[in-house]
């Protein structure tokens, strides 16, 4: 039975040209995390393998950085980065847990940062 839950940064906003950290946390399970995939709509942004480390998609190499932890840092944000992001935790023996984050990239310099995992 899958008992775990994923806590995420939820709905967040950031300024165009800035950076943001996407963060998820899996709790309430003793399952072993084997890999975490970060996806944006139909694109795979990055993979963090528990044994092997990080690989960033070749199409996002310039704008995505691994970490902190199992999180992902998006840089040089554009309004086209607005949308849903998913952290997909592959675990053993539980299976797959998915967390959702909605990012809004604002033109204005008054983007609000409300989530506790976010860059201040």
């Amino acid at each position: 039975m899958m008992t775990g839950t994923i806590e995420t940064t939820g709905n967040i906003s950031a300024e165009k040209g800035g950076s943001i950290i996407l963060q998820c946390h899996l709790s309430s399970t003793t399952a072993q995390v084997t890999q975490v995939n970060w996806e944006q709509q139909d694109q795979l942004l990055a993979i963090c393998n528990a044994d092997l480390g990080w690989h960033i998609s070749p199409s996002f190499k310039d704008r995505v950085a691994p970490g902190p932890g199992l999180g992902l840092t998006l840089q040089s944000l554009t309004v086209n980065d607005t949308g849903e992001y998913f952290c997909i935790y592959h675990t053993y023996p539980d299976g797959t847990y998915t967390g959702r984050i909605f990012l809004e990239v604002l033109e204005s310099s008054v983007a609000e940062h409300g989530a506790r995992f976010q860059i201040p």
Epitope: D42, L44, I47, N49, L52, G53, H55, P58, S59
Partner: antibody, heavy 119, light 107 residues
Framework: EVQLVESGGGLVQPGGSLRLSCAAS????????MYWVRQAPGKGLEWVAS????????YYPDTLKGRFTISRDNAKNSLYLQMNSLRAEDTAVYYC????????????WGQGTTVTVSS | DIQMTQSPSSLSASVGDRVTITCKAS??????VAWYQQKPGKAPKLLIY???ARHTGVPSRFSGSGSGTDFTFTISSLQPEDIATYYC?????????FGQGTKLEIK
């Protein structure tokens, strides 16, 4: 069992067009990035195109941009490569391949379909 | 573009021999390197990904190592069925690029 079966190859004249297809089975097609890779006779492997899971983004080497178009139909479990303005140097075996779920790497390949561009 | 320079281009070895192929990237590709085996008239098969991880079902005599720009592929004890051409590939950056291949023959 993962299966990828290419079709649509053949003999075409320079300047002509051809559409290759790849029928996928044995896995949830819509969950995977897909690729086309080609191999000219007696030569090495050359990446041709990539497409994301839903088909929203496509990638090509600069040398092929504008002439080749990768697409997919997830309802039909099919991948396509539209090739226009074909040249003699496009003569090759064309393979479709699936991206691994563990990494950005091609883990399963079809048997290939042969394209010959000649007058 | 990242060039993958593979060496040697061909080699002849005896059954039971340890065989080593090297691949040098023209710039840092971290560990985003795969190795494929291609037998005549057949499609390539993935052997190694993430520079050193064996793909499902690949025998333990095949191994890979390296990071950055220098990578090595090893067959610890050559078997007759290993006769093939082997390719390295980097997938760190677009365009994805392959080495020119190493044709392995039995002495």
């Amino acid at each position: 069992e993962v299966q990828l079966v290419e079709s649509g190859g053949g003999l075409v004249q320079p300047g002509g067009s051809l559409r290759l297809s790849c029928a996928a089975s044995g896995f949830t097609f819509s969950d995977y990035y897909m690729y086309w890779v080609r191999q000219a006779p007696g030569k090495g492997l050359e990446w041709v195109a990539s497409i994301t899971k839903g088909g929203g983004s496509t990638y090509y080497p600069d040398t092929l941009k504008g002439r080749f178009t990768i697409s997919r139909d997830n309802a039909k479990n099919s991948l396509y490569l539209q090739m226009n303005s074909l040249r003699a140097e496009d003569t090759a075996v064309y393979y479709c391949a699936r991206q691994s779920s563990y990494d950005f790497v091609m883990d399963y390949w079809g048997q290939g379909t042969t394209v010959t561009v000649s007058s | 573009d990242i060039q993958m320079t593979q060496s040697p281009s061909s080699l002849s070895a005896s059954v039971g021999d340890r065989v080593t192929i090297t691949c040098k990237a023209s710039q840092d590709v971290d560990t985003a390197v795969a190795w494929y085996q291609q037998k005549p008239g057949k499609a390539p098969k993935l052997l190694i990904y993430w520079a050193s991880a064996r793909h499902t079902g690949v025998p333990s005599r095949f191994s890979g190592s390296g990071s950055g720009t220098d990578f090595t592929f090893t067959i610890s004890s050559l078997q007759p069925e290993d006769i093939a051409t082997y390719y390295c590939q980097q997938y760190s950056n677009y365009p994805l690029t392959f080495g020119q291949g190493t044709k392995l023959e039995i002495k």
